[in-house]
């Protein structure tokens, strides 16, 4: 038993042109989280096979809001390690899938929205108890940097976590043939139950007397490294009968082939034979098929009938990217006309129209006056989505149905008396005042503050407001 630990160091734009847009915006702040899936062995497994070694989900990272105009930086990450416990022996070789997820925190209908930003996969050899291994993987324009290790949980020890430790029986030393259990120096290895001589580093057993080899090793005691190079190579055959021991450094040393590819030496360099689903000089390119469902958000996968043919994704509205993994801010295109409010619901775009406008994009100006009559000779005026009546003199209200009392507002100044008249109002001014609203005092010398009175009207006469 033990734990696989994954430490994410950074997730951000990779080198080169075509830097991705930040996945978060001021309108849609978001945070990242990660998922890791582990499968044993380098053998090609069906893509839909479960995470047989285990899976783990990280905590959510800090909320991030894009700075307008700034390129996407490395995004803030969740704290802590992703830990995947394993119950049985550590297989020594494993496949991993690491997914970077975005949780959008904007006004989402039905809570936060999740979308997959990037998915990387690889196959690696790793001994338990070893140091942290560092790795960089790219997914489209994104780059993920991380470290990983496998460690045994006491009492298990060894590169496969199959050897057991037990407390010392004597205070000074372990029994014959048994070593102290590093790092638990106060404990000793339990007696081995494997076949005598079975390599403690490269072999393990689950039944007494057996010796099963970790991938990459062979022989009855798992002491012979498997080499894919021919034993009749120029450097000569090995004396071993169960495998090929290559004495000098060769181009296949350290196996440059990724994702479980096998290396063969060529006169000038090496050649990788890639497992199904991978290709490229070092098997570094994943040949995903449409049946694997590589298009996110319901995208249509075209081509990619077999691993050697590329696929393309035809994205649903509102998504883009080579795998439809990026949400388009469709409202940034301002599709709603006439001041309508844009709502991107993910599966649809909606415009909430201002009064007086309609249509999917608020493109229709409603005829506010259609079927609306203004009474008593009023005329209908369209505007701002609400019909309005311009009423004839003496009438008011929304539809000009109310008889207006022009004197209600006490329009005559200085104690003038107001009389309603069919065409408006008339002010009868108090002595000493004149004007349509009795607003001007008559001067003592007989001159008025107004210009000469119009013909036919004497100062002080009731002034009719025309």
């Amino acid at each position: 038993a033990g734990v696989f630990e994954l430490q994410i160091h950074s997730f951000g734009p990779g080198p080169g042109p075509g830097a991705p847009r930040s996945p978060c915006s001021a309108r849609l702040p978001c945070r990242l989280f990660f998922r890791v899936c582990l499968k044993p062995g380098l053998s090609e497994e069906a893509a839909e096979s479960p995470c047989a070694l285990g899976a783990a989900l990280s905590a959510r990272g800090p909320v991030y809001t894009e700075q307008p105009g700034a390129p996407a930086p490395d995004l803030p990450l969740p704290d802590g390690l992703l830990q995947v416990p394993f119950r049985d022996a550590w297989p020594g070789t494993f496949s991993f899938i690491i997914e970077t997820w975005r949780e959008e925190l904007g006004d989402q209908i039905g809570g936060p929205a999740w979308s997959l930003l990037a998915r990387v996969a690889g196959r690696r050899r790793l001994a338990a108890g070893g140091p942290w291994a560092r790795d960089i993987q790219r997914a489209g324009a994104w780059e993920l940097r991380f470290s990983y290790r496998a460690r045994c949980e006491p009492p298990a020890v060894g590169t496969a976590c199959t050897r057991l430790c037990r407390p010392r029986s004597a205070p000074s030393r372990c029994g014959p043939g048994l070593r102290p259990c590093a790092p638990l120096e106060d404990e000793c290895e339990a007696p081995l139950v494997c076949r005598a001589g079975c390599s403690p580093e490269h072999g393990f057993c689950e039944q007494p007397g057996e010796c099963r080899c970790l991938e990459g090793w062979t022989g009855p005691l798992c002491t012979v490294p498997v080499s894919t190079s021919s034993c009749l190579s120029p450097r000569g055959p090995s004396s071993a009968t169960t495998g090929c021991l290559v004495p000098g450094p060769g181009p296949c040393d350290g196996n440059p082939c990724a994702n479980g590819g096998s290396c063969s030496e060529t006169p000038r360099s090496f050649e990788c034979t890639c497992p199904r689903g991978f290709y490229g000089l070092r098997c570094e390119v994943s040949g995903v098929t449409c049946a694997d469902g590589p298009c996110f958000n319901g995208g249509l996968c075209v081509g990619g009938a077999d691993p050697d043919s590329a696929y393309i994704c035809h994205c649903p509205p509102g998504f883009q990217g080579s795998n439809c993994e990026k949400r388009v801010d469709r409202c940034s295109l301002q599709p709603c006309r006439n001041g309508g409010l844009c709502l991107d619901l993910g599966h649809a775009l909606r415009c909430r129209c201002r009064a007086g406008f309609a249509g999917p994009r608020c493109e229709h100006d409603l005829d506010d006056c259609a079927g609306r009559a203004c009474a008593n000779g009023g005329t209908c005026v369209e505007g701002g989505g609400a019909h309005r009546c311009s009423c004839a003199l003496g009438f008011g209200g929304r539809d000009c149905r109310e008889r207006a009392d022009p004197c209600a507002a006490r329009p005559c100044a200085h104690g003038g008396r107001c009389y309603a008249h069919f065409s408006g109002l008339v002010c009868a001014c108090a002595p000493g005042y004149m004007g349509a609203r009795c607003e001007f005092p008559v001067h003592p010398d007989g001159a008025s503050a107004l210009p000469a009175a119009p013909p036919g009207l004497r100062p002080g006469d009731p002034q009719r407001y025309l």
Epitope: A291, G293, G298, P317, G359
Partner: antibody, heavy 117, light 107 residues
């Protein structure tokens, strides 16, 4: 080869219930949105509903005509999507197909549901 | 919901004929239109996506065109296996909606 196989159709009385299943093979099922689309006798195609992925909290969407009566669920471990139909009406009589994705790229062969008294 | 109106509802043609089916959307759907073929007793098959792109394995005699509200499916030279019902569907706005279908029969 991609295969979607529907089952569970049959004759049911109005107001009754039925549960359809769609078993997928040849695809990484857990990566696909799944839909149900129906076709009434001699009529066109009508989208019924959709279920999305685990990473999307298995979000579901339904046509107005079935909202509140039909429920879609999925079991990724069994590569199967289900359509639970309650309070069935005569107008629900149709061949029901399961399809994948947003654009309905893969289709099953269909299962017939007849609602009649 | 967006309405898709297909015409004609049926047509008779001979092998080798050029056949054109039209579909009209009740509002702008961009190029988010697909065409499906359905043979009697079988499930529909995707032919064209994105208004004009042939899906994997679809013969080149099938072509699609149009954008906005008016779309066309053309079969350049009708083959015996093409006698079927054809449906257009819009995927611009959720929910997806289909036309009423066009039945292509042997003359």
């Amino acid at each position: 080869e991609v295969q979607l196989v529907e089952s569970g159709g049959g004759l049911v009385k109005p107001g009754g219930s039925l549960r359809l299943s769609c078993a997928a093979s040849g695809i990484t099922f857990s990566n696909f949105w799944m839909n149900w689309v129906r076709q009434a006798p001699g009529k066109g195609l009508e989208w019924v509903g959709q279920i999305r992925l685990k990473s999307e909290d298995y979000a579901t969407h339904y046509a107005e005509s079935v909202k509140g009566r039909f429920t879609i669920s999925r079991e990724d471990s069994k590569n199967t999507v289900y359509l639970q139909m309650n309070s069935l009406k005569t107008e629900d009589t149709a061949v029901y197909y399961c399809t994948t994705g947003y654009y309905f790229d893969y289709w099953g062969q269909g299962t017939t549901v007849t609602v009649s008294s | 919901n967006i309405q898709m109106t297909q015409s004609p509802s049926s047509l008779s043609a001979s092998v080798g004929d050029r056949v054109t089916i039209t579909c009209k959307a009740s509002e702008n759907v961009g190029t988010y239109v697909s065409w499906y073929q359905q043979k009697p007793g079988k499930s529909p098959k995707l032919l064209i996506y994105g208004a004009s792109n042939r899906y994997t394995g679809v013969p080149s005699r099938f072509s699609g065109s149009g954008s906005g509200t008016d779309f066309t499916l053309t079969i350049s030279s009708l083959q015996p296996e093409d006698f079927a019902t054809y449906y257009c569907g819009q995927f611009y706005s959720f929910p997806s909606t289909f036309g009423g279908g066009t039945k292509v029969e042997i003359k």
